[in-house]
């Protein structure tokens, strides 16, 4: 014989000894009908705030208040946003490793410093965990076939460098 609890809709509960579908009481929910009890709604307060409110058919969803971010499945914890020089990992905020930086507050990942030499430039200022390196102007490199002659120009004392 089919139990009439099987016909209960989400938002209700049903006890087998009295198989009548009853609405979940306030502040409780059931996403599956026919369960013997409704679940207590999650509360979002303190460092949490509501992303979804609890209804008779679904639980509340929480997010973290501004300046904090979620950790764990379904945002079980709130942690202060990462500072510049850090990135968010599954274990929380971690300092950027040597040779990487993050200049953003609260978001972003650690990115490698710019490789100045790839553009034929020198490093003007070394990088930190919070700031990228600053590259200098292009380095003038001379090949062996280059001839340099200094010729007087524009009157006495005037010289110009000519690369031929």
């Amino acid at each position: 014989v089919q139990n009439s609890c099987d016909n209960c809709q989400p938002g209700t509960f049903c006890r087998k000894y009295n198989p009548v579908c009853k609405s979940c009481p306030p502040s409780t929910f059931s996403s599956i009908g026919g369960q013997p009890n409704c679940n207590i709604c999650r509360v979002c307060a303190g460092y949490f705030r509501f992303k979804k409110f609890c209804s008779s058919t679904h639980n509340a969803e929480c997010e973290c208040i501004e300046g904090f971010h979620c950790l764990g499945p379904q945002c079980t914890r709130c942690e202060k946003d990462c500072r510049p020089g850090q990135e968010l990992t599954k274990q929380g905020c971690k300092t950027c490793s040597l040779g990487t930086f993050n200049d953003q507050n609260g978001t972003g990942v650690c990115r490698p410093w710019t490789n100045c030499s790839l553009d034929g430039r020198s490093v003007l200022k070394t990088g930190t965990t919070e700031k990228d390196v600053v590259c200098g102007p292009p380095v003038v490199s001379f090949s062996p076939s280059t001839t340099i002659s200094v010729t007087p120009e524009g009157g006495p004392g005037g010289h110009s460098l000519q690369v031929l």
């Epitope: 306030p26 502040s27 509360v43 303190g46 509501f50 409110f53 008779s56």
Partner: antibody
């Protein structure tokens, strides 16, 4: 900064359908939900429903059968539709951000023949 | 649905006086939220998470309570506090408001 603005007809005939628009700025509809709340003249506040960040909705069971809330995320607009209007639907209609920290200025709707 | 009963419906207070508004819930709620509404204006979130003052709310206001009984208090009434105050629960939908308490200046 965060702003919400309601728009719609001031006067609607009984039995007709009311369509209101809430245009938001300063936040994204894909991050935050938007409520509709109404207030009949000289009376208290009544929560009508909400559309969430993911497009899901929750409604006030008392008017659920006549109510629908939808959105257009590209235009940052939320829509409220109430059908089979009655004179007691005459009210100031407000939209508000999910945390009720920002409200629109409201739009007055009169249902009368 | 959770029904919120506010009392008193109307109250008149003199400047400097202490004012208390209560809100009773038909079933237990985790936190209470309060709004201030002045004539012709939209409501403003006034107190959240039962006791936290919203941005810009003077600290003469306070909120307290738990379970089914909550209250909003004004330590020393000022003329600018004359308004209607509503309580609201967020524990489960439908989110419900109290019927409001009109606070007048004596």
């Amino acid at each position: 900064q965060v702003q919400l603005k309601e728009a719609g007809p001031g006067l609607v005939q009984p039995t007709q359908t009311l369509s209101l628009t809430c245009t938001v700025s300063g936040f994204s509809l894909t991050s935050d939900g938007v409520h509709w709340i109404r207030q009949p003249p000289g009376k208290g506040l009544e929560w009508m429903g909400i559309i969430y960040y993911d497009g899901g909705t929750d409604y006030n069971s008392a008017i659920k059968s006549r109510l629908s809330i939808s959105r257009d995320t590209s235009k940052s607009q939320v829509f409220l539709k109430i059908n089979s209007l009655q004179t007691d639907d005459t009210a100031m209609y407000y939209c508000a951000r999910i945390h009720f920290d920002y409200w629109g200025q409201g739009v007055m709707v009169t249902v009368s023949s | 649905d959770i029904v919120l009963t506010q009392s008193p419906t109307t109250i008149a207070a003199s400047p400097g006086e202490k004012v208390t508004i209560t809100c009773r819930a038909s079933s237990s709620v985790s936190y209470m939220y309060w709004y201030q509404q002045k004539s012709g204006a939209s409501p403003k979130l006034w107190i959240y998470d039962t006791s936290k003052l919203a941005s810009g709310v003077p600290n003469r206001f306070s909120g307290s309570g738990s379970g089914t009984s909550y209250s909003l208090a004004i330590n020393t009434m000022e003329t600018e506090d004359a308004a209607t105050y509503y309580c609201q629960q967020w524990s489960s939908t439908p989110l419900t408001f109290g019927s409001g308490t009109k606070l007048e200046i004596k």
